[in-house]
Amino acid sequence: PGPPAGSPRVSSDPRADLDSAVLLTRSLLADTRQLAAQMRDKFPADGDHSLDSLPTLAMSAGTLGSLQLPGVLTRLRVDLMSYLRHVQWLRRAGGPSLKTLEPELGALQARLERLLRRLQLLMSRLALPQAAPDQPVIPLGPPASAWGSIRAAHAILGGLHLTLDWAVRGLLLLKTRL
């Protein structure tokens, strides 16, 4: 069960704001995991799939220990904007094979948009600059084949899953330092 819909609670407590962002991130993580599992059931993946247009994972050894809140929020927002674009692209160009997952992809997109709004609100409350992506946006062309769109879906969901885990870990870790 996801959190109830509705506008964010007004608060001047950064811990409460972070809590709210963590909750949405955890909800989205659960949705993504479920959808990735559905994908694996319907279209078994042979090994790891990657997509050049996806952001590189915001994780490297030692990263979490040295995180600062502005960096986490900025990086997370930029990466999630990229994933949102990829989910929109999947829904638009995924072809008939992914049409069966359309309701789930639609729900995932809505949750992603909601989390992005919450992060934007949190950043404005903390007076952080709303950074634009530093890398140029790579246009997403149509998948080469039906199998290409399935591989892309595996890559997008897998990457989003790991990014959200990094986000929950990072945000909760930062909360302990506030």
Partner: antibody, heavy 119, light 111 residues
Framework: EVQLVQSGAEVKKPGASVKISCKAS????????MDWVKQAPGQRLEWIGD????????IYNQKFTGRATLTVDKSASTAYMELSSLRSEDTAVYYC????????????WGQGTTVTVSS | DIVLTQSPASLALSPGERATLSCRAS??????????IHWYQQKPGQAPRLLIY???NLASGVPARFSGSGSGTDFTLTISSLEEEDFATYYC?????????FGQGTKLEIK
């Protein structure tokens, strides 16, 4: 069958270090975090920290920061925990456990490694 | 850190009886429909085994006689009809914040 198999019991002197391994099998290693939990005699279970095998940095319980080091060898589906500057209070059973991403509940556990610190 | 207190410390019951174990958190571990409490069973010389996750979800392979309930700060693990193999120590654990912490355990003994 999903399994976590840990290295054998260790006896160490105070001030020494110990490195425990945890070999995962039966699932995709990078789909879950690997957590470590301490169980000292007569004490409650204590979470030490976790690591995302996909390449994320570890996170630690503040109590263990600076003494515990978590690493993984992705190619061997193996996680490691090293504990340094050992003291008698570190005498315990140490478990590795598979952690659900973002939720910190542990659905598969290793059999445990007993570490005894004694002079 | 959030402190979890389990009660009773020990409980002696007979097979077939109903067991009710309690776990109280020092602050709320629930938020918007999610309760970040999990329950484990541990037998002597063995590793803990996950029974219930997120307050009320039965872990894979766990018999339906186990159930979890509660929200906010008060949680309950119920075993509807005790079997011989259920006599063990039970721990609750939260994952609302970092670090996750465990209760001190409730030892369930045969009467």
């Amino acid at each position: 069958e999903v399994q976590l198999v840990q290295s054998g019991a260790e006896v160490k002197k105070p001030g020494a270090s110990v490195k425990i391994s945890c070999k995962a099998s039966g699932y995709t290693f990078t789909d879950y975090n690997m957590d470590w939990v301490k169980q000292a005699p007569g004490q409650r279970l204590e979470w030490i920290g976790d690591i995302n095998p996909h390449g994320g940095g570890p996170i630690y319980n503040q109590k263990f920061t600076g003494r515990a080091t978590l690493t993984v060898d992705k190619s061997a589906s193996t996680a490691y925990m090293e504990l340094s500057s050992l003291r008698s209070e570190d005498t315990a059973v140490y478990y590795c456990a598979r952690g659900e991403l973002g939720h910190w509940y542990f659905d598969v556990w290793g059999q445990g490694t007993t570490v005894t610190v004694s002079s | 850190d959030i402190v979890l207190t389990q009660s009773p410390a020990s409980l002696a019951l007979s097979p077939g009886e109903r067991a009710t174990l309690s776990c109280r958190a020092s602050k709320s571990v629930s938020t918007s429909g999610y309760s970040y409490i999990h329950w484990y069973q541990q037998k002597p010389g063995q590793a803990p085994r996950l029974l219930i996750y997120l307050a009320s979800n039965l872990a894979s392979g766990v018999p339906a006689r186990f159930s979890g309930s509660g929200s906010g700060t008060d949680f309950t693990l119920t075993i509807s009809s005790l079997e011989e193999e259920d006599f063990a120590t039970y721990y609750c654990q939260h994952s609302r914040d970092l670090p996750p912490t465990f209760g001190q355990g409730t030892k369930l003994e045969i009467k």
